[in-house]
């Protein structure tokens, strides 16, 4: 299953099969997601380990049993690969490093006014995988507002330094902001020019494309069919790249079929994961296991669940069936292709679902109508989650955020359906970010069912929480994708990076703004937060944010949004905003439902028809 | 409309026990907190104790810890303060008062008289 | 614990005059005061809380400021309904009150 716990001062011992540097433990694990082997990794900070050369060293790291040794190392930060973790995985990696120089091959320079602006010129340059910027307090005046952008063979930084008033970080393409576009078409009987980075067998030029969107060098690919006229080249896939970033030449091939990376696709990439099942055709590679089971569904649900089966062949021969059930080879290779394609066989073949977003139906659960002030505008994916309530009368309007916490689930505020319980009038918006893009033609979802606590009362803060059941699932993309729960009861968590998101006023007596809005909350102790509020009993049921100077809150029209709060590289949802005196105001924090109280609740109502649960808690 | 309604007033013998009732009304007494306050003859407040009584944890002034327990009922949206072992120096008016951080909404008072 | 100390324990005004109370708590209370007035025979009524503000429906010539230890309450034009004895409250750890405060019309 998914482990999401990292372990701080441990390093695994062995098991290794790839190293590199980045900047954080998060990007380490990501890249250990990824790797085809990797089921573990430990990275060393800066701080941890005198000798330079492994500073910022990410080490990956397989091991048969699905564990390995754990050796003290203070500093050093150990966890588990994130696959079969469903919607965590991304190769999104937002963060920008203050005071590290990330290293690499430097092949575009130019003057910019702010680290955000060399992000995303790096994002709309074809070739750049990370980029550094010197800011303006750099020590050589020369230098100051340089923006560097880098590349490198594997796609992680060569070495990454210390260095003072410099800025990394790496290119938003795999988070489908890049502003380049994409080339969807494929060419039939056309074969691409150019330098080969990497080479792997697969049964179709969409694997071969899947494949090269997050390969960090290939730009376009070619593909070789399994009739192609040289038999040991039949099924191969070739990864290219170029100077320019596109193919020198293309020439007209039988049997061949070319097409390009689709990580320049702006607002929606391929799943990491290839979900088809190919009929007749066997995957050669190294034997992990050999199951019994019936039919070749289940055989892929078997490799999916077993964490380091890459692809499988289900095997139809009558030698290898017993009654109903049939042999399920699960296998696996270096690069997690299959080593060998046959075809006109007897069997089906396919691969595991591990790194597919969707993953099964679950969801890592690792007064006043309330309301932002004082905040600043989000970016496209940044609060994936996060989604607009509107009620749709005479006019359409903006009433409330909520969170998705599920294919069909949306956590919100039981208080947003105070005199509006019709489920008819509802609209919910998800994977939006400008309130004005909506138009009649914005896909919406409709709600089946609308779940209020069954202890709320119509003008009290207690109990404030309510589940909106959607008429249809939706997919998982880098722009709409759930938020995971809190564990049950979970108290012991110290949460000090929490912010608070949604379209709602930005002063006491304002309107609702068009972008949505965030901003950073600290959290403040219930026995302080009582104090501020003379009248309203602060339950262990409800959580406070809120500076003591006030200025930055939430406001009229963010009830039911989230708050979240990232802890060990992950945002969890802490609380759901409920009430509070006015907005943003001197020593009123914002009060929020807490969801770690309400845990069993959710848990309970998300059940679906069958018993099984629609969510679960992180171990 | 919020009120908390006292039963009252009570003449007892030193040594004796009493039980005072706040009632409330317009407010489930779940929703909030119960405070007690005593006020003796021509002196100012002291703060008792106070009960949360959707859980009947409670708070109470160190000094007096063991002469005074607090109960609620939900049931009957009643909160209780029982005294213990009177003296003359417990003759005073007894209030109740509800409120988060502090107390907001007060009842009438009972007066309680120690006398042999 | 913590004590506040109020004074003066009386004082005699004119309507239309100026009234000031102050009240030293023995530990900072982080601003965690409030003040209450209470007329003969009534329950005492919450004026001001977290030192300076208003409780909704008090009016506007009621006051209160300080911070750390010492604290004031004001009443910028005093008038004949205001006649009461007015207590301070500590609330910062548990509850202490002052020992009052009455106001008489000269």
């Known amino acids: 299953g998914c482990l999401t716990q990292l372990y701080e001062n441990a390093f695994f011992r062995g098991g290794d099969v790839a190293s590199m540097y980045t900047p954080n433990a998060q990007y380490c694990q990501m890249r250990c997601t990824f790797h085809p082997r990797c089921l573990l990794f430990s990275f060393l900070p800066a701080s941890s380990i005198n000798d330079m050369e492994k500073r910022f060293g990410c080490f990956l790291k397989d091991s048969v049993t699905g564990t390995l040794p754990k050796v003290h190392r203070t500093g050093a930060v150990s966890g588990h690969s994130l696959k079969q973790c469903g919607h965590q995985i991304s190769a999104c990696h937002r963060d920008i490093y203050k005071g590290v120089d990330m290293r690499g091959v430097n092949f575009n320079v130019s003057k910019v006014s702010s680290v955000e602006e060399c992000q995303k010129r790096c994002t709309s340059n074809i070739r750049c995988q990370f980029f550094s910027y010197a800011t303006q307090t750099f020590h050589k005046a020369e230098y100051r507002n340089n923006c560097l952008l880098k590349y490198s063979p594997g796609g992680t930084p060569t070495a990454i330094k210390v260095l003072s008033n410099v800025e990394s970080g790496f290119s938003l393409k795999p988070c489908a902001l890049s502003e380049i576009g994409c080339h969807m078409n494929i060419f039939q009987h056309l074969a691409f020019s150019d330098v080969d980075v990497a080479r792997v067998l697969t049964p179709d030029a969409f694997v071969c494309r899947t494949i090269c969107t997050y390969h960090p060098n290939c730009l376009f690919f070619t593909f070789y069919t399994n009739v192609w006229k040289i038999e040991s080249q039949r099924n191969v896939c070739l990864l290219k790249t170029s100077e320019s970033g596109t193919p020198s030449s293309s020439t007209p091939q039988e049997n061949t079929i070319s097409g390009y990376s689709l990580l320049t696709c702006k607002r929606t990439l391929p799943e990491p994961c290839h979900s088809k099942i190919y009929p007749g055709v066997d995957f050669g590679g190294e034997e992990l296991n050999v199951t019994f089971v019936k039919g070749v569904n289940v055989c892929q649900e078997t490799c999916t669940k077993m964490i380091r089966c890459q692809f499988f062949t289900y095997s139809l021969l009558p030698e290898d069936c017993k009654e109903e059930k049939c042999k399920c080879f699960l296998r696996l290779s270096m690069d997690g292709s299959p080593t060998r394609i046959a075809y006109g066989t007897q069997g089906s073949s396919g691969y595991s679902l591990r790194l597919c977003n969707t993953g099964d139906n679950s969801v890592c659960t690792t007064k006043t109508s309330t309301r932002i002030v004082g905040g600043t505008n989000s970016s496209w994916g940044e609060w994936p989650w996060q989604v607009s309530l509107q009620v749709k009368l005479t006019a359409q309007r903006h009433l409330c955020g909520g969170s998705l916490i599920g294919h069909q689930w949306v956590l919100t505020a039981a208080h947003c359906f105070d005199g509006l319980p019709l489920q008819d009038v509802w609209r919910i918006y998800s994977g939006i970010l400008n309130l004005s893009d909506i138009t009649k033609d914005t896909p919406f979802s409709q709600i089946k069912e609308i779940i209020i606590h069954q202890n709320y009362k119509v003008s009290e803060g207690n109990h404030d929480i309510a589940l909106i059941k959607l008429q249809a699932p939706l997919n998982y993309t880098e722009f709409q994708k759930p938020i995971c729960l809190p564990s049950k009861g979970d108290t012991s968590t110290i949460y000090t990076n929490c912010w608070v998101t949604g379209w709602g006023f930005s002063k006491e007596k304002g309107e609702i703004q068009n972008i949505l809005q965030k901003v950073n909350i600290p959290l403040v102790t219930n026995e302080e937060c009582q104090k501020r509020y003379q009248d309203y009993k602060i339950t262990q049921r409800m959580v406070c944010a809120g500076y003591k100077e006030g200025g930055k809150d939430a406001c009229k029209g963010d009830s039911g949004g989230p708050l979240v709060c990232k802890h060990n590289g992950m945002w969890r949802l802490v609380g759901i905003t409920s009430w509070g005196e006015g907005c943003a105001r001197r020593e009123q924090p914002g009060v929020y439902t807490k969801v770690a109280e309400y845990m069993d609740w959710i848990l309970e109502k998300t059940q679906s028809s069958d018993g099984k649960a629609q969510m679960q808690s992180p171990a | 409309e919020v009120q908390l309604q006292q039963s009252g007033a009570e003449l007892v013998k030193p040594g004796a026990s009493v039980r005072l009732s706040c009632t409330a009304s317009g407010f489930n007494i779940k929703d909030t907190y119960i405070f007690w306050v005593k006020q003796r003859p021509k002196q100012g407040l002291e703060w008792i104790g106070r009960i949360d009584p959707e859980n009947d944890n409670t708070k109470y002034d160190p000094k007096i810890q063991g002469k005074a327990t607090l109960t609620a009922d939900t049931s009957s949206n009643t909160a209780y303060l029982q005294l213990s072992s009177l003296t003359s120096e417990d003759s005073a008016i007894y209030y109740c008062?509800?409120?988060?951080?502090?107390?907001?909404?007060w009842g009438q008072g009972t007066l309680v008289s120690v006398s042999a | 614990d913590i004590q506040m100390t109020q004074s003066p324990s009386s004082l005699s005004a004119s309507v239309g005059d100026r009234v000031t109370i102050t009240c030293e708590a023995s530990h900072d209370i982080n601003n965690y005061i409030a003040w209450y007035q209470q007329k003969p025979g009534k329950a005492p009524k919450l004026l001001i809380y977290?030192?300076?503000t208003l409780q909704s429906g008090v009016p506007s010539r009621f006051s209160g400021s300080g911070s750390g230890t010492d604290f004031t309450f004001t009443i910028s034009s005093l008038q004949p309904e205001d006649i009461a004895t007015y207590y301070c409250?500590?609330?910062?750890?548990?509850?202490?009150f002052g020992q009052g405060t009455k106001v008489e019309i000269k």
């Open positions: 409250l500590q609330y910062d750890n548990l509850f202490t």
């Open positions: 008062a509800k409120g988060g951080g502090l107390f907001a909404y």
């Open positions: 977290y030192t300076s």
